[in-house]
């Protein structure tokens, strides 16, 4: 799961108007009896940034220790620092658990820079803010790590939800969320709505913020607005969709769809930016470029080297295009769209020495290892993993930042032709899976 | 705060090479590329190159290439600008800067002396 | 690359007067030009990005203006820590490039 821009995780976005959340529409089609309602009890139970990452608190051993968990949609390993590191307030103290049972096996996960390693184990985790339930889940101890931890994320351990085919130190390790499902009455499914705050947070305000909501096991209808679309998981790894058109402002970048999901296009909540193939990277700045072009920005900007700023409250949304995905929808030969405006993908920095002006970064920046959909698409969407059905949700989400000319949208149906030939199948001999 | 720490002098051989160290403190480390601007006694200033810590990207000056090499240790949040083959042209003051809007803050600066 | 020209090394000025230092670049830059400030043996300290914004705590008697080639510092009521040397830079294309400085000096 890819470090470096990944991991290191950041808000998301927008500056003004700041409180505008949409209204809840009425006209919804019902699903199956028990999917879908009030999770009250987990609604809220994320916190953080998207900066930073957002976290969910857990609970490892006997008697419960009390750990925060980075939720991370694009990996599949439940891993906690259990060893004193400088970054850490807190970490997981075997020795002081009566349920901790020892695996004898260790586990190295390199990243392209960085890394973790620590020893497998079993041991009784649960969700405070979750379903209520106990599970015996593999643990990854974090003994030694490097670029891993971020300083003052307030977040100790990862929670990997995607599938075990990218576990490590191989597949035969099942994931947490597996042993969940296997180990109770919990659905097969979690859906997650990330908020992203629209302005920059201190520390102190992170950690007294509400970042979204985990809802495991269904799907909360008080977070989103309009109807949810779903698009197919196309192989159980990564969270693996196809992308069939990129559009800047309605504009076609008339690539071959191949571009898009080359090698891969995935969801993953612990990505802050848009990430996109350089050759896509490449016609997206562009055409954002050219739709913005009433205001000359520095190279660096783009390159998400360079800030820009604006006079507080006067940042010009308006100059800068919304950016529309099409996905492959559930039925053949048709697609949905979803689009994210630039409060989702223009990041709200607070640098103290440019404090009296509104600051952003752009979050959309190249990848060599296909497109991720990370934060800065997740924040304006509900998201529903619906691992039952092979199948991802999107819907709006009721927390997304937007202003009151534009807001993110999920629309659909459209007519797509030819839609499989947009996946990139990866040659066999590709073992690289996590070193990235 | 943030605050940029370098070492306030290097005399170094020519020929040999030298590592030149700044550790940033008071703000998350990997949010901001790191620059490095060269300096000679009575002259103007030189941009060198920029590294981003979150993934060790660099962007060079051409006049640059080959000569400074950049690297970050993220686990003690300081960047580093190795200058090899040096010659008394190479004698300046070495400063490292944080980006944000163009260069907010800067280091106090390495004076780098070449001298056999 | 983009050249910055400051076409006056060393500008002469007294205490209290109204000074202005100026930078051109080679091309059009937009409004992506900072300003330093630097006291001989000391690092530059930022004092104005985005051609016009003044960087958090810098004296409002420091006023940026201009766009596209040409750009001047202003100092209004200049005082005698102001007597050191300026710098303009351009951050919109790389190589980053800067002016080679102007000098304040009493009349």
């Known amino acids: 799961t890819q470090h470096g821009i990944r991991l290191p995780l950041r808000s998301g976005l927008g500056g003004a108007p700041l409180g505008l959340r949409l209204p809840r529409e009425t006209d919804e089609e019902p699903e199956e009896p028990g999917r879908r309602g009030s999770f009250v009890e987990m609604v809220d139970n994320l916190r953080g940034k998207s900066g930073q990452g957002y976290y969910v608190e857990m609970t490892v051993g006997s008697p419960p220790q009390t750990l925060n968990i980075l939720v991370d949609t694009g990996s599949s390993n439940f891993a906690v620092g259990a060893a004193p590191h400088p970054f850490l307030h807190r970490y997981y103290q075997r020795q002081l658990s009566s349920t901790y049972r020892d695996l004898r096996k260790g586990v190295y996960v390199p990243y392209t820079q960085g890394k973790w390693e620590g020893e497998l184990g079993t041991d009784l985790v649960s969700i405070p803010h979750g379903p209520n339930v106990t599970v015996r889940a593999n643990i990854a101890a974090i003994t030694e790590s490097d670029k891993f931890f971020i300083n003052g994320s307030n977040w100790e351990g990862i929670l990997g939800l995607a599938y075990a085919e990218i576990a490590r130190p191989d597949d035969s390790l099942e994931p947490f969320f597996d042993s969940l499902v296997k180990q109770t009455h919990v659905p097969n499914l979690f859906s997650l709505q990330l908020c992203g705050a629209g302005f920059p947070l201190n520390q102190s305000e992170v950690l007294a913020s509400v970042g979204g909501s985990m809802i495991i096991g269904g799907i909360d209808h008080s977070l989103y607005t309009g109807s949810l679309w779903y698009t197919p998981i196309r192989r159980e790894w990564y969270y693996e969709v196809i992308i069939v058109r990129v559009e800047i402002n309605g504009q076609d970048l008339k690539m071959d769809c191949k571009e898009y999901n080359y090698d891969k296009s995935i969801v993953d909540s612990g990505t802050t930016n848009l990430r996109l193939p350089k050759k896509v990277f490449e016609a997206a700045v562009k055409s954002i470029k050219a739709a913005s072009s009433t205001e000359k920005f520095p190279d660096g900007f783009w390159l998400g080297e360079q800030l820009v700023c604006w006079q507080a409250g006067t940042t010009p949304w308006n100059i800068f295009p919304v950016i529309s995905l099409y996905l492959m929808g559930e039925v053949t030969n048709q697609s949905f769209r979803i689009t994210i405006l630039p409060q989702q993908y223009l990041r709200p920095v607070e640098d103290v020495a440019t404090s009296q002006d509104d600051c952003y970064k752009f979050a959309i920046s190249q990848s060599s290892t296909g497109t991720v959909m990370g934060a800065v698409i997740m924040e304006g969407f509900y998201v529903v993993f619906d691992r039952a059905r092979k199948r991802i949700g999107f819907a709006v989400s009721a927390c997304h930042v937007h202003d009151e000319f534009r807001t993110a949208a999920v629309e659909g149906p459209f007519v797509t032709l030819d839609m499989e030939d947009c996946g990139y199948n990866i040659p066999q001999t590709d073992e690289s899976t996590l070193m990235t | 705060e943030v605050q940029l720490q370098q070492p306030g002098t290097e005399l170094v051989r020519p020929g040999t090479s030298v590592k030149l160290s700044c550790k940033a403190s008071g703000y998350t480390f990997t949010n901001y590329w790191m620059h490095w601007i060269k300096q000679r006694p009575g002259q103007g200033l030189e941009w060198i190159g920029m590294i981003d810590p979150s993934d060790t990207y660099t962007k060079f000056n051409q006049n640059f290439k080959g000569k400074a090499t950049l690297t970050v240790d993220t686990s003690s949040s300081t960047a580093y600008m190795q200058l090899n083959s040096l010659t008394s042209e190479d004698s300046a003051v070495y400063y490292c800067?944080?980006?944000?809007?163009?260069?907010?803050?800067w280091g106090q600066g390495t004076t780098v002396t070449v001298s056999s | 690359d983009i050249l910055m020209t400051q076409s006056q090394k060393f500008m002469s000025t007294s205490v209290g007067d109204r000074v202005s230092v100026t930078c051109k670049a080679s091309q059009n830059v937009g409004r992506n030009v900072a300003w330093y400030q630097q006291i001989s043996g000391q690092s530059p300290k930022p004092l104005i990005y985005?051609?016009?914004h003044r960087y958090s705590g810098v004296p409002d008697r420091f006023t940026g203006s201009g766009s596209g080639t040409d750009f001047t510092l202003t100092i209004s009521n200049v005082q005698s820590e102001d007597l050191v040397e300026f710098f303009c830079q351009q951050y919109n294309s790389y190589p980053y490039t800067f002016g080679g400085g102007t000098k304040l000096e009493i009349k």
């Open positions: 985005s051609a016009s």
């Open positions: 800067a944080r980006s944000g809007v163009a260069f907010p803050y």
